[in-house]
């Protein structure tokens, strides 16, 4: 559904979108897994949290993440199609006071302790480009998505519409 530079074009105004209201429109706990059903897990090591992508043993419990969904308003003068649009933004918190952050300099995904209001690096634009899977695009860096690299979460630049469906940026949410 994009031209050659579609991803850059359709995300160009993400920087300017404003989150309507401070409170999320909905929140719920879910486990996060990859397209290939590996689990995203969080471990406390040396007073900081590490994020892993791994196969769980048969009866091992999946880590849960609190997903908070926010509505982001896109004024028509920015949206490029003459109509006010809304996006879903999400923050992900695996444990109290810690949130996933995009570290754009290091192309990494990190867990940071912080207070509200959360910084823009903690917000991700929600996409469901694939049946029953979601992707998380950095609010601070349009065209860059949370993805899986070497059994860790990393930031992955998506430079064409075909790559929007690449398996390493697709995730499944499950409340069970």
């Amino acid at each position: 559904a994009f031209g050659i530079s579609g991803v850059q074009k359709y995300t160009r105004a993400l920087h300017d979108s404003s989150i309507t209201g401070i409170s999320p429109i909905t929140e719920y706990l879910a486990s996060l897994s990859t397209y290939n059903d590996q689990s995203i897990t969080f471990a406390l090591e040396d007073e900081s949290y590490e994020i892993y992508v791994e196969d769980l043993k048969k009866d091992e419990k999946k880590d849960k993440v609190l997903l908070s969904y926010y509505e982001s308003q896109h004024p028509s003068n920015e949206s490029g199609d003459g109509v006010d649009g809304k996006m879903l933004m999400v923050t992900l918190s695996p444990t109290k006071d810690f949130w996933l952050h995009a570290n754009n300099k290091e192309h990494s995904v990190e867990l940071h302790k912080c207070e509200k209001p959360l910084p823009d690096q903690a917000f991700f634009v929600l996409h469901n480009m694939h049946s029953n899977c979601v992707s998380f695009e950095c609010k601070t860096d349009p065209g860059v998505f949370i993805g899986v690299k070497d059994n860790h979460l990393a930031l992955i630049k998506v430079d064409s519409s075909e790559n929007l469906c690449t398996e390493n940026i697709l995730f499944k949410l499950s409340e069970t």
């Epitope: 909905t26 490029g80 199609d81 929600l126 996409h127 469901n128 480009m129 049946s131 469906c165």
Partner: antibody, heavy 121, light 107 residues
């Protein structure tokens, strides 16, 4: 403003292929998913499938073997083809646009007026 | 597929009445539920999305509640233009299934 308009033949013969087009204006197919939904006379709504903003397509598994959704970006059109139709496919066919950019979680905010397709010889 | 069961299938009410329609999902759908209003010969109109959010231009007498598997659409004071059929729809997983509809008729 946002508009969706379905068009296509109102009468299709059994075993033939039903072809409909949804022409959209006031928004970009690169930002919003467009869905096809149908409603048999006097009955409820059935979701057929979606062309998502990224160009991927999802279908209702009950119809998957017979349905094809495609797009023509240059014409701002989304097409629906349903093969091997029977009288049970007689319905009003709607196209509808997602409420949210990039995501279907918010339901369908804008609908076409619908077009009645009758399957009969 | 996720089954959506609406109740009642029809109801008779008077102008000014408080009307409640329920929708039950066969598995959890978080809050990814929409409600639509459809009048005869017209397209459905989005009333509520994300279970509780009022769509643009929808009167505040409409409200939605619920999460998980149990959801409710409430019309606080029924108006003449509210006589229609109402559908719930889950948007948690494809196929995005609808309830069978609730027809609200004049008593």
């Amino acid at each position: 403003q946002v508009q969706l308009q379905e068009s296509g033949p109102g009468l299709v013969k059994p075993s033939e292929t039903l072809s409909l087009t949804c022409t959209v204006s006031g928004f970009s197919l690169s930002k919003y998913g467009v869905h096809w939904i149908r409603q048999p006379p006097g009955k409820g709504l059935e979701w057929i499938g979606v062309l998502r903003a990224g160009g991927t397509i999802s279908y209702n598994s009950a119809l998957m073997s017979r349905v094809t959704i495609s797009e023509d970006i240059s014409k701002s059109q989304v097409s629906l083809k349903l093969s091997s139709v029977t009288a049970a496919d007689t319905a009003v066919y709607y196209c509808a646009r997602d409420h949210y950019y990039y995501s279907s979680f918010g339901g369908f905010a804008s609908w076409g007026q619908g077009t009645l397709v009758t399957v009969s010889s | 597929d996720i089954q959506m069961t609406q109740s009642p299938s029809s109801l008779s009410a008077s102008v000014g009445d408080r009307v409640t329609i329920t929708c039950l999902a066969s598995q959890t759908i978080a809050t990814w539920l929409a409600w639509y209003q459809q009048k005869p010969g017209k397209s459905p109109k989005l009333l509520i999305y994300a279970a509780t959010r009022l769509a643009d231009g929808v009167p505040s007498r409409f409200s939605g509640s619920g999460s998980g598997t149990d959801f409710t659409l409430t019309i606080s004071s029924l108006q003449p233009e509210d006589f229609a059929t109402y559908y719930c729809q889950q948007l948690y997983n494809t196929p995005y299934t609808f309830g069978q509809g609730t027809k609200v008729e004049i008593k």
